[in-house]
């Protein structure tokens, strides 16, 4: 009879194991052991008994002590289970992110581990257990199924093995995956609200701003403005579960036509975004052209007002004619034209609104001098030792210097308060001087003494 | 004792497809995933593909996605290797090798090699 | 992909002195587990490849205890300390930590 020691064991891969081969005959024509696996005997008297060092067992095995007594051949086994925890349990790899609501499937492989019959997989939440499950095929696989929800976010999900040898008088060996940090995420399917100018002109600053609500976490919302190929760089306002996106946009000639703006919120892998249309406009004021901006009474003048190609234009509150962007007036420049204003006034069509811009200049006419009865009398009559206050007004562009002078030096004062005396009697010329020339007038003063009343 | 045992040589004409088949004997056929490597003459032995006996999963090098497609029989205990739109540079021995489905513990028990001869 | 060069690219051995043979991979086999997925495979005239070693120095089931692996990150040594006839052949090392899977060029190793 043979027997073997131990009956079964359980060791670690590449582990060795001493194995005891007895018979039950003292004589034993033949005492020997069976196996692939490298062997070493250890020499022990007798030789009914062989202890056998196996090395480097990879793989369960069976080695076969045997033994030839006179009554027969016999033979037993020893049953070695080699034991090794997975060389990897891994989380299959998902986005980080995930939308509340969905379902997120969690899938986790085991490779290797042995004995497989002791091999549980356990899928986590934390510490919570969500699915538990024997470890079968290579790779093991075992998935679950958790619907996202909002405090989801944060958590950490991961995938362990438990190789429980405890049956075995071992341990329990435990392997862990890397964990998977799940962050949960609302996007509204509603787009963000834009507000913004539908136009806007060259060189000028408008303000944009991108807002919407509903979102988690916000403060993981990335927010992208831009006009055309310009990003903008917003300031940032952030609610408990919104946010306000302002902007400055500047734009030049570069940019003129029909550009489009975009507000893109990005959070988690998803994105909303709006598109609105913004159309950048060069349009100069109008210019009012005068043949000369300073002529002489009587000269012909053309006033024209040129705007924008599609502006309409109006000229002194006259549009003209026919409707379009140039206008003009003549006149015949007259010493009441002096000063006179000519606006011009032109409205442009953009983008469905009516721009309006007006420009004005004026008009200098040079007349002159003139001195007539009205402003400067020709006979002034004041009783002796009165007060007076001699008046004698010249017109003219430019405005005349006045000197009225009796023989030539003896000067009227013009615009002073004066006592009639005998010496203000006589004639005096008048005579207003400009760059337009000289004109004179003849002023006689009488006084009236009181011997004559 | 564990065994893969391919089929035979192949020559195929450019263009042509093969199926190459390697059947396991000597253990648990669904306990093991099975890899495929080639050797082109005077080139390194290149790694092609891996399929999960178990569950039919299959993982491909980049090198060779859309070229071959990896299956498995477990009724038959047996894994085929499809290479499509053959040209002379698929001349190599082609191995099945028997590993963990990441080969972690290296590649244990290889196939005899098929020899693939593609020529016009 | 991951680079395995082995020097040398062949080595003449005297029968029962010891051999050493290299490898170096482009980048760290250091798996995110903490452990190095390098294995040596030798490759007899004819014959299809044949796993020594696995996991840098773990010796598979059946390989003669002359066999030895070392090393760690991106340097590997695979050592035979007396070399026999019966270990003529092409010896590999080959890498499972990285995807794809790559094989080192190969050392032939012949006697003297």
């Known amino acids: 009879q043979t027997s073997v020691s131990p009956s079964k064991v359980i060791l670690p891969r590449g582990g060795s194991v001493l194995v005891t081969c007895s018979t039950s005959c003292d004589q034993p024509k033949l005492l020997g052991i069976e196996t692939p696996l490298p062997k070493k005997e250890l020499l022990l008297p007798g030789n009914n008994r062989k202890v056998y060092e196996l090395s480097n067992v990879q793989e369960d095995s069976q080695p076969m002590c045997y033994s030839n007594c006179p009554d027969g051949q016999s033979t037993a086994k020893t049953f070695l289970t080699v034991y090794w925890t997975p060389e990897r349990v891994e989380l299959a790899p998902l986005p980080s992110w995930q939308p509340v609501g969905k379902n997120l499937t969690l899938r986790c492989q085991v490779e290797g581990g042995a004995p497989r019959a002791n091999l549980t997989v356990v899928l986590l939440r934390g510490e919570k257990e969500l699915k538990r499950e024997p470890a079968v095929g290579e790779p093991a696989e075992v998935t679950t199924t958790v619907l996202v929800r909002r405090d989801h976010h944060g958590a950490n999900f991961s995938c362990r093995t438990e190789l429980d040898l405890r049956p075995q008088g071992l341990e329990l060996f435990e392997n862990t995956s890397a964990p998977y940090q799940l962050q949960t995420f609302v996007l509204p399917a509603t787009p963000p609200q834009l507000v913004s100018p539908r136009v806007l002109e060259v060189d000028t600053q408008g303000t944009v701003v991108c807002s919407l609500d509903g979102l988690f976490p916000v403060s993981e919302a990335q927010v992208h403005l831009a006009l055309g190929d310009q990003r903008l760089n917003p300031t940032v306002t952030y609610g408990n579960d919104s946010f306000s996106a302002k902007a400055s946009v500047s734009v030049t000639a570069e940019d003129e036509g029909t550009q489009r703006l975009t507000c893109a919120v990005i959070l988690g892998n998803q994105s909303q975004e709006t598109l609105q249309t913004v159309t950048i406009y060069s349009f100069p004021a109008p210019n009012v052209i005068l043949t000369k901006p300073e002529v002489s009474e009587g000269t012909e003048v053309t006033v024209k007002c040129e705007a924008h190609p599609r502006a309409k234009v109006t000229l002194n509150g006259v549009p003209a004619q026919p409707l379009g962007p140039r206008a003009q007036l003549l006149l015949k420049a007259t010493p009441e034209d002096n000063g006179r204003s000519f606006s011009c006034s032109a409205t442009l069509e953009v983008a469905g609104q009516l721009i309006h811009k007006n420009q004005t200049r004026e008009l200098r006419v040079l007349y002159g001098p003139r001195l007539d009865e009205r402003d400067c009398p020709g006979n002034w009559t004041w009783p002796e030792n009165s007060q007076q206050t001699p008046m004698c007004q010249a017109w003219g562009n430019p405005l005349p210097e006045l000197k009225c002078l009796k023989d030539g030096t003896f000067p009227l004062p013009i615009g002073e308060s004066v006592t009639v005396t005998r010496d203000l009697e006589g004639t005096y010329l008048c005579r207003a001087r400009s760059t337009q020339g000289e004109v004179t007038r003849k002023v006689t003063v009488n006084v009236l003494s009181p011997r004559y009343e | 004792q564990v065994q893969l045992q391919q089929s035979g040589a192949e020559v195929k004409k450019p263009g042509a497809s093969v199926k190459i088949s390697c059947k396991a004997s000597g253990y648990t056929f669904t306990d093991y995933a099975l890899h495929w490597v080639r050797q082109a003459p005077g080139q390194r032995l290149e790694w092609i593909g891996v399929?999960?006996?178990?569950?039919?999963?299959?993982k491909y090098s980049q090198k060779f996605q859309g070229k071959v497609t990896i299956t498995r029989d477990t009724s038959a205990s047996t894994a085929y290797l499809e290479l499509s739109s053959l040209r002379s540079e698929d001349t190599a021995i082609h191995y099945c090798?028997?590993?963990?489905?990441?080969?972690?513990?290296?590649?244990?028990?290889w196939g005899q090699g098929t020899a693939l001869t593609v020529s016009s | 992909d991951v680079v395995l060069t082995q020097t040398p690219l062949s080595s003449p051995v005297t029968l029962g002195q010891p051999a050493s043979i290299s490898c170096r991979s482009s980048?760290?086999?250091?798996?995110?587990?903490?452990?190095?997925?390098l294995h040596w495979y030798l490759q007899r005239a004819g014959q299809p490849p044949r796993l020594l070693i696995y996991?840098?120095?773990n010796r598979f089931s059946g390989v003669p205890d002359r066999f030895s692996g070392s090393g760690a990150g991106t340097d590997f040594t695979l050592k035979i300390s007396r070399v026999e006839a019966e270990d003529v052949g092409v010896y590999f090392c080959s890498q499972n930590t990285h995807f794809p899977y790559t094989f080192g060029g190969g050392t032939k190793l012949e006697i003297k």
């Open positions: 980048q760290t086999l250091v798996y995110r587990n903490g452990n190095t997925y």
């Open positions: 090798a028997r590993s963990l489905y990441f080969g972690s513990s290296g590649f244990d028990y």
């Open positions: 399929i999960s006996t178990y569950s039919g999963n299959t």
């Open positions: 996991k840098v120095s």
